[in-house]
């Protein structure tokens, strides 16, 4: 049981941080002008990874997309392509760990099968995350770097556009989007990956051995039995049933094409 | 088309309190903030201030703060102009003007303000 | 503030003719996102304004290729090639970049 909480809850909160990250990739505000110098401005510039908008101070707002890709500056690029590597791992891993889920059954699929699956969709949601935070961090960076040096009147390119030393940018809400999704995927992958040393099955086949205590005589009977891994709520070895790789609480007659539990 | 439609000419006592509208068509309204300019009788444009007709937010240059009060009506597209406790040298021609850029004027309201 | 400065209250010109008119403010309305905030209005006899050029030189909707407007950070250009009758009245310059935003006293043209 606690194995599948563990599964699920890695499954969601991975759900929850690759649409952050998704969200975090799509959103206008990376880098936001810093108006500690100059809060009389009328025109406030904002910042993502694929266009930059300016809004004017009674709330219209205008966005101008990147239409270069080599006069990009080679950071902006790399943070670009490490959000979208997370995002396809991400995605990837959430589409493996649904199939992976103890509580949704697919034909006659094993538990090794799906404790497989379970570490693969887990390491996916480690290095998606692992991405995300890597290339928030790697803006964030490139933004203390221009904030400094702006600051000691040198003039600074982000964006792919011109910023004197009027003007400074400072983090916008999709760093610390980026870095919380980024979190919560790496959390869940970890989470998937203890849930797969509970769902991998340590089988051994015991002989048949005759104990004589005093008192009273108990034989174990030959039979194959599932041994525990001591994760989760399975601590208690389970007999199998005709053979095959399902415990007590699993037991299934026939599979049917769509069996969910 | 794009219209910004002002309310008619007032003719006012000292002291009174005068209530001017402007009606948008033709946009969204509330994607647009709304200025209001000055311009006394021969002299040139003076900016008032604006109001952020999605939020209501309010900002008063500073000769215009305390008599002077933006509002709106979102459901009717209307901006208002309401100045209080009028005086002489309010007597003027008010401009209401679409967003930062003024791209769109009303066509102005006269204030006279005579004892 | 930010003062915005026409030094000639009115221009004379021949229709047909071309015509600069000119506008200084006290600081530079480059904004660090490349664009400079300085618009210009005209307003004809007993009508409302008109905006004209946006952010220095960009010609507003419905407005004549007549119209042109250039300039650095501080300095800037109105220019009217072949003026005609309907471009008599007063040309105002504005910026937006600060609060409070601010015109110019405006300068009139007359047709001789």
């Known amino acids: 049981m606690a194995v599948t909480a563990c599964q699920g809850l890695g499954f969601v909160v991975s759900l929850i941080g690759i649409a952050g990250i998704i969200a975090a990739t799509c959103m206008d505000q990376w880098s936001t002008q810093d108006l500690y110098n100059n809060p009389v401005t009328a025109v406030f510039n904002y910042q993502g990874l694929w266009r930059s908008c300016v809004r004017e101070s009674s709330g219209f707002t205008e966005c101008r997309g990147y239409f270069t890709l080599l006069g990009l500056p080679a950071m902006l690029q790399a943070v670009r392509a490490l959000m979208i590597v997370g995002i396809v791992l991400g995605a990837i891993g959430l589409l493996v760990s649904i199939f992976a889920l103890k509580c949704i059954r697919i034909g006659s699929m094993e538990d090794s099968a799906k404790a497989n699956m379970t570490l693969t969709s887990g390491i996916m949601f480690i290095v998606s995350g692992l991405c995300a935070i890597a290339g928030v961090s790697v803006f964030a960076n490139m933004l203390v770097t221009n904030f400094w040096m702006s600051t000691a009147n040198m003039y600074t390119g982000m964006g792919g556009m011109v910023q004197t030393v009027q003007t400074r940018y400072t983090f916008g809400a999709a760093l610390f989007v980026g870095w919380v999704a980024g979190g919560l995927t790496l959390i869940g992958g970890v989470m998937m990956c203890i849930a797969c040393r509970g769902l991998a099955p340590e089988e051994t086949n015991y002989k048949a051995v005759s104990y004589h205590a005093s008192g009273h005589s108990v034989a174990y009977k030959p039979g194959g039995f599932k041994a525990s891994t001591g994760f989760g709520s399975n601590t208690k070895n389970k007999k199998i049933y005709d053979g095959g790789a399902r415990t007590e609480d699993e037991v299934q007659s026939y599979p049917s094409k769509h069996d969910y539990v | 088309q794009i219209q910004l439609a002002q309310s008619g000419p007032e003719l006012k006592k000292p002291g009174e309190t005068v209530k001017i509208s402007c009606k948008a068509s033709?946009?969204?309204?509330?994607?647009?903030?709304m200025n209001w300019v000055k311009q006394a009788p021969g002299k040139g444009l003076k900016w008032m201030g604006w109001?952020?007709?999605?939020?209501?937010?309010?900002k008063y240059a500073d000769d215009f703060k305390g008599r002077f009060d933006f509002s709106l009506e979102t459901s009717a597209r209307t901006a208002y102009l309401q100045i209080k406790n009028l005086k002489i040298e309010d007597t003027a021609t008010y401009f209401c003007?679409?967003?930062?850029?003024?791209?769109?004027w009303g066509q102005g309201t006269s204030v006279t303000v005579s004892s | 503030d930010i003062v915005m400065t026409q030094a000639a209250p009115s221009v004379p010109v021949t229709p047909g003719e071309s015509v600069s008119i000119s506008c200084r403010s006290s600081?530079?309305?480059?904004?660090?996102?490349?664009?400079?905030?300085l618009y210009w209005f005209l307003q004809r006899p007993g009508q409302s304004p008109q905006l004209l050029i946006y952010r220095m030189s960009n010609l507003a909707s419905g407005v004549p290729d007549r119209f042109s407007g250039s300039g650095s950070g501080t300095a800037f250009t109105l220019r009217i090639s072949r003026v005609e009758a309907e471009d008599v009245g007063v040309y105002y310059c504005?910026?937006?970049?600060?609060?409070?935003?601010?015109f110019g006293s405006g300068t009139k043209l007359e047709i001789k």
């Open positions: 109001i952020n007709t999605y939020s209501g937010e309010t």
């Open positions: 003007a679409r967003r930062d850029a003024m791209d769109y």
């Open positions: 033709g946009y969204s309204f509330t994607n647009y903030g």
């Open positions: 504005m910026q937006h970049l600060e609060f409070p935003f601010t």
């Open positions: 600081k530079s309305l480059l904004n660090s996102n490349g664009n400079t905030y």
